[in-house]
């Protein structure tokens, strides 16, 4: 039959060439002379000339060595024609399979592989995967089947076999316990890939395994005991810097310290923060310390990390003895602001109050007093006793110095410390009203017609407070009642002035006496301009001229 079985040819054959592979033969050669030819890639098309055929015998020839990794299979067509060129057979398919030789070494995809694993993990933990390729056949032969192995490990601490590699997949895993970043932060493995499933050619590469930090080291105080001196009353004062060491990776959450005052700060006087660069604990005062109340504080500070510990670790504690230093403190008025009620207009030399200060210091310091601010100059203060007395007339109605009945004075106390310190107090004198002002009418100038005059309503004001004000009483004096009447309204806060007899046009004085509810009398002269007119007027009309 005009057929040929697939032909297997090993790659890299050493010849001699041309090498006879198989004979094409048509059974039509009994009837006529047959000429054989081949076509297809490898024969008459690229790569041309790899195969040929002996025209008359039909021997298929290989002209040069084959390379399976370049072309693994050739598909040619065999042709049989008679002397006159007529085809005597259908074209025949010729398959030439190039069989593999182990002519390639494995190649790692990288010269150096990098991976990482957390310190302290259990054996079996995967680290990374390495890959090598081999161009040879791995399906029908072992030529391209790669087996991985670890050739060496550096350093060899704590064991020479900290890692293993899956022979088929190239996955590197931890096999031994004891990975400790603080002792060995990085391992370099020389890895091998060997073809023939481990029995052939070998190539090497490097796998670098970085050991990642776990928070398996506690920060430790160094030193553990501190003594500090702090002036009393200082707020935000740096008391002490506490230093810790931590073997974990610097500037990581496993290294960064967190400080906590565990004891000794009953009054919540202290606070502690972490310095972002040095990792030190900065102990500062949150409130002022009081030497007189407690001159020594013993604090206990515990340190942990931002990250939780991966295992139970003993925490480090520091002891800080804080000595409070005495400071000459300013005297403090008690109370800081004192309210005293006093009658206005009390006689000069009359005592107002005693206003004294206390010195927080335990020494018996002498305190002297003086007035710091007395806007009206109404008061004096005894430097030794703090006795405040009136030296001027306290006037409740003085709008320049008194606001809402209160006269404000600032006083000063000074101790005899070295250097001396001062404290201030505020004395608020609430001035009690005295009936020292009579009622006053407004306005005090009026204009009125002498014919059918309009009644003039005057408002009554009194600077005093109730009950020294309305109801008011009015009385005309000095014969003013001959021409005028004065009547207070029902509410008692206005007076109505009326012209009861004709007066010629001129200016007159009306003598009006007003008294308040406390019978304080005030005489006021009203200037009345009388005009020749009827009813209501604001200014007198000019003289009338006839025409």
């Amino acid at each position: 039959d005009w057929v040929v079985a697939p032909i297997s040819v090993p790659e890299n054959g050493k010849g001699p060439f041309p090498q006879r592979l198989n004979q094409l033969k048509s059974n039509k050669d009994r009837d006529t002379k047959i000429f054989y030819s081949i076509t297809g890639p490898g024969a008459d098309s690229p790569p041309e000339g790899v195969f040929a055929v002996e025209k008359e015998t039909g021997w298929l020839l290989l002209n040069k060595p084959l390379d399976r990794e370049e072309i693994a299979k050739y598909e040619l067509f065999g042709h049989a024609v008679s002397e006159n060129g007529a085809s005597v057979e259908d074209p025949m398919n010729i398959s030439i399979i190039v069989t593999d030789q182990n002519d390639h070494k494995p190649k790692f995809t990288q010269d150096t592989f990098r991976g990482s694993v957390l310190e302290g993990v259990l054996p079996g933990t995967s680290v990374m995967q390495v890959t090598a390729t081999d161009e040879d056949d791995a399906i029908y032969t072992y030529n391209g089947v790669v087996a991985y192995s670890i050739h060496s490990q550096e350093p060899k601490d704590p064991h020479d076999l900290m890692f293993t590699i899956h022979r088929s997949t190239g996955t590197i895993s931890v096999i031994s316990s004891g990975l400790d970043r603080e002792k060995v932060p990085e391992y370099t493995l020389t890895i091998q890939a060997t073809d023939m499933d481990g029995d052939g050619s070998t190539t090497t590469a490097v796998a670098v395994v970085e050991i990642l930090d776990a928070n398996d080291n506690a920060p430790m105080f160094d030193p553990q005991k501190y003594e500090a001196h702090v002036p009393e009353n200082a707020v935000g004062h740096e008391v002490q810097r506490l230093t810790v060491t931590d073997l974990d990776a610097p500037n990581s959450p496993a290294w960064r310290a967190t400080y906590l005052i565990m004891g000794g700060d009953d009054g919540d006087h202290f606070t502690i923060t972490t310095h972002p660069e040095s990792n030190q604990g900065i102990l500062t005062t949150r409130k002022g310390l009081d030497f007189e109340a407690k001159n020594q504080h013993t604090l206990y500070v515990e340190v942990t990390n931002e990250a939780p510990f991966v295992l139970k670790l003993p925490t480090s504690t520091a002891t800080i003895v804080v000595h409070v230093e005495d400071v000459n403190e300013a005297p403090v008025f008690v109370p800081p602001s004192k309210v005293v009620e006093v009658q206005e207009g009390i006689p000069t030399g009359e005592p107002v109050c005693v206003y004294t200060a206390e010195d927080p210091d335990k020494e018996n310091q002498k305190i002297s007093y003086r007035i710091l601010r007395d806007p009206a100059g109404w008061l004096a203060m005894d430097p030794d006793s703090g006795q405040v007395t009136a030296v001027g007339t306290l006037d409740r109605e003085d709008e320049q110095f008194v606001r809402n009945n209160i006269y404000e004075v600032m006083v000063l106390a000074m101790d005899n410390g070295s250097p001396p310190t001062t404290g201030t107090g505020t004395l608020l004198l609430t001035l009690i009203d005295v009936n020292d002002h009579g009622p006053v009418p407004e306005p005090r100038q009026i204009t009125i017609c002498n014919q059918s005059p309009v009644r003039q309503v005057l408002n009554i004001t009194d600077k005093d407070l109730s009950p020294h004000t309305s109801p008011f009483q009015a009385q005309l004096t000095d014969d003013s009642d001959i021409y005028w009447t004065a009547e207070v309204n029902e509410e008692g806060d206005t007076v109505v002035l009326s012209l009861k007899k004709f007066l010629k046009q001129d200016t007159y004085d009306v003598h009006l006496s007003l008294s308040d509810h406390g019978n304080k009398e005030q005489l006021t002269v009203i200037r009345a301009t009388v005009c020749d007119c009827h009813g209501h007027v604001e200014t007198c009309p000019g003289p009338w001229k006839g025409g």
Partner: antibody, heavy 117, light 111 residues
Framework: EVQLLESGGGLVQPGGSLRLSCAAS????????MSWVRQAPGKGLEWVSA????????YYADSVKGRFTISRDNSKNTLYLQMNSLRAEDTAVYYC??????????WGQGTMVTVSS | QSALTQPASVSGSPGQSITISCTGT?????????VSWYQQHPGKAPKLILS???KRPSGVSNRFSGSKSGNTASLSISGLQAEDEADYYC???????????FGGGTKLTVL
């Protein structure tokens, strides 16, 4: 020479608790992963739990997960197994074992745990 | 159901040789050369007799030998002696949380 001595076994009712201890000596305890392996009467070896040298990583067999807790105190060279909600099928000899550098185990003599009402 | 498969029992007469097989997968026995064999006498703790397929710890008789082919490891005991009667367990390293797998054990009887 590695020496491991288990203690804490005994008879306990179902649902009860026991705490096994394993005192280690003869090696740098904190550098080695440790395991508990059990063997039910007449049966084979069964991996129960493991803990890394630092104590930061642990492993449990599905059959004990959520009931048993492995821990270690490196300052005392001691391994522990806290066993809660015990069942009849937890009856076994419990061995403490250290994981050697060449994927081998060094074994203690074992302690018997019997769960029965 | 153990991860590694061993015959339940084998037997042999004194002086004879026997072989115990331990079959795993390409992810344990087949992947790593970390197969160990343990001997356990009744009432005793297991004792390591072979590590890394074929390495004997000091003090273990050279009558014990090991080998591996593909996914199967084997323990061979030559010149059987009465004291060899015991249970034998194979174990293999594997990647993952269950980093050590055990075989179901093989009871060796010396006839």
């Amino acid at each position: 020479e590695v020496q491991l001595l288990e203690s804490g076994g005994g008879l306990v009712q179902p649902g009860g608790s026991l705490r096994l201890s394993c005192a280690a000596s003869g090696f740098t305890f904190s550098s080695y992963a440790m395991s508990w392996v059990r063997q039910a009467p007449g049966k084979g070896l069964e991996w129960v739990s493991a803990i890394s040298g630092s104590g930061g990583s642990t492993y449990y067999a599905d059959s004990v997960k959520g009931r048993f807790t492995i821990s270690r105190d490196n300052s005392k060279n001691t391994l522990y197994l806290q066993m809660n909600s015990l069942r009849a099928e937890d009856t076994a000899v419990y061995y403490c074992a250290s994981w050697g550098p060449r994927a081998t185990l060094d074994w203690g003599q074992g302690t018997m745990v019997t769960v029965s009402s | 159901q153990s991860a590694l498969t061993q015959p339940a029992s084998v037997s042999g007469s004194p002086g004879q040789s026997i072989t115990i097989s331990c079959t795993g997968t390409s992810n344990d026995v087949g992947a790593y050369n970390y197969v160990s064999w343990y001997q356990q006498h009744p009432g005793k703790a297991p004792k390591l007799i072979l590590s890394e397929v074929n390495k004997r710890p000091s003090g273990v008789s050279n009558r014990f030998s090991g080998s591996k082919s593909g996914n199967t490891a084997s323990l061979s005991i030559s010149g059987l002696q009465a004291e060899d009667e015991a249970d034998y367990y194979c174990s293999s390293f594997t990647s993952g949380s269950t980093f050590m797998l055990f075989g179901g054990g093989t009871k060796l009887t010396v006839l």
